[in-house]
């Protein structure tokens, strides 16, 4: 409030200068301050059924100044108004009041959400997010090769986050089982990540089922079809071994 | 809603005199600090006086002081400009309009020509 | 007095396009500051105070900024019925004082 507050010690005239404490430069016993040195704001202060002026470094809380050649004045705002402009606009409410277009109000209007922290309504933000990224490449516990069956998974990023009554985002990552013609690991290239591999287009015939929740998928198991027993894993390597041409097609 | 209708503007050769008025509605005239600002032909704002809510206090921008007085009449909800001594260079339209710092309302504003 | 020094005095730009406008005060006013919009034949219109600070049913494409001596007002997409002449005015102290004005004019 930076208060410098004058008040008169001794009973004077009201526009006998001497004796006044403070920032006054004129005051009177029944009235406190009457006017007040270069540059400080005069104001009314309510005590009981009394005003009293006084003079100020700058406006209090709850008043606004404004600055006439021959004084500086405090003026009240609204009442439920804390800081303003002027008696119209409102730029800070009370304690329990959203501003909104220099007004305070009690609850936000339709289509504005309260911000609890600027206490401010607000347009409602709703999640936005971006296209989805390619497929990664096909995978297995992290390696490209020495698989038939593994998962791939995509992301898309939040774009804008959504405020308290906005549209909550939808998943940002998704992920499928994809299908491969098995390839042996090569020797180096044992323990390789999908990532580091050069993608190529996806093998005719392909089957991938998309599942839009990748972290319920990253911890399931294996359905039972999708188990290979050892007999017909026996089969698939004389296959492999007859084939003249080794398909090397990673997805 | 807020209303602010100016009259009493025309035309008036140099060194006579012309009165404006306001008529106010829609808000709370006597609340309001309330000042003319006036705009030649094609030119900018220029602020020419304000009286403050209870009329006891008046100010005039320097190209009027001494040659135009500023006044109101709360019972009635009406502003006034008293302009003696007019000048060519007076030649605006006038604007009534509620002064808080910000110029919040205005009225449609009265033309005032001085020619001889 | 403050002077106020608003550039540029006209300004033409077409629909959907980004403008500003500027006002340089002589001194220090921190914000108390307001932009009006004025059509031809018509009285100015407040439409931003507080340096910052949207008027009610002044579209949010407006907006106000700066603090000091340096204020900005910025259309981020013009429409049709933006054109007009803008006017910037110091708050801090009598006399009132107002900037120029930028006649912005459909290009």
């Known amino acids: 409030q930076n208060a410098s507050r004058g008040r008169r010690q001794r009973r004077m005239h009201p526009n006998v200068s001497q004796g006044c404490q403070g920032g006054c430069a004129t005051c009177s016993d029944y009235n406190g301050c009457l006017s007040c040195k270069p540059r400080l704001f005069f104001a009314l202060e309510r005590i009981g059924m009394k005003q009293i002026g006084v003079c100020l470094s700058s406006c209090p809380s709850g008043y606004y100044g404004t600055r006439y050649p021959d004084i500086n004045k405090c003026t009240k705002c609204k009442a439920d108004c804390d800081t303003c402009f002027n008696k119209n606009f409102c730029t800070k409410c009370k304690s329990g009041f959203y501003l909104h277009l220099g007004k305070c109000l009690d609850n936000c209007p339709e289509g504005l959400e309260a911000n609890n922290h600027t206490m401010e309504c607000v347009s409602i933000v709703h999640c936005e997010v971006s296209e989805w990224n390619p497929w990664s490449p096909c995978t297995k516990k992290g390696k490209t090769c020495g698989f038939k069956r593994g998962t791939e998974t995509r992301v898309r990023e939040i774009i804008q986050h959504p405020s308290a009554k906005g549209n909550l985002c939808p998943p940002t990552n998704e992920t499928r089982k994809c299908t491969v013609q098995r390839k042996k690991c090569q020797k180096g290239e044992r323990g390789k990540k999908g990532r580091e591999r050069k993608r190529k287009k996806p093998n005719k015939g392909e089957s991938k089922e998309a599942i839009p929740d990748s972290k319920s998928l990253e911890s399931s198991k294996e359905i039972p079809e999708q188990r290979e027993n050892k007999q017909q894993q026996k089969k698939r390597k004389v296959q492999d071994k007859q084939k003249s041409v080794s398909v090397s097609t990673v997805h | 809603e807020v209303q602010l209708v100016e009259s009493g503007g025309g035309v008036v050769q140099p060194g006579r005199s012309l009165r404006l008025s306001c008529a106010a509605s829609g808000f709370t005239f006597s609340d309001y600090d309330m000042a003319w600002v006036r705009q030649a032909p094609g030119k900018g704002l220029e602020w020419v006086a304000t009286?403050?809510?209870?009329?006891?206090?008046?100010y005039f921008g320097d190209s009027v002081r001494g040659r135009f007085t500023i006044s109101r009449d709360n019972s009635k909800n009406t502003l006034y400009l008293q302009m003696n001594s007019l000048r060519a260079e007076d030649t605006a339209v006038y604007y009534c309009?509620?002064?808080?710092?910000?110029?919040?309302?205005w009225g449609q504003g009265t033309m005032v020509t001085v020619s001889s | 007095d403050i002077q106020m020094t608003q550039s540029p005095s006209s300004l033409s730009a077409s629909v959907g396009d980004r403008v500003t406008i500027t006002c340089l005060v002589s001194?220090?006013?921190?914000?108390?500051f307001v932009w009006y919009q004025q059509k031809p034949g018509k009285s100015p219109k407040l439409l931003i105070y507080?340096?910052?600070r949207l008027q009610d049913g002044v579209p949010s494409r407006f907006s106000g900024s700066g603090s000091g001596t340096d204020f900005t007002l910025t259309i981020s997409s013009l429409q049709p019925e933006d054109f007009a002449t803008y006017f910037c005015?110091?708050?801090?102290?009598?006399?009132?004082?107002f900037g120029q004005g930028t006649k912005l004019e459909i290009k």
């Open positions: 005015q110091q708050s801090y102290k009598y006399p009132p004082t």
């Open positions: 001194e220090d006013i921190s914000n108390d």
């Open positions: 309009t509620a002064h808080d710092r910000s110029f919040d309302y």
């Open positions: 009286i403050i809510y209870d009329g006891s206090r008046a």
């Open positions: 507080a340096a910052s």
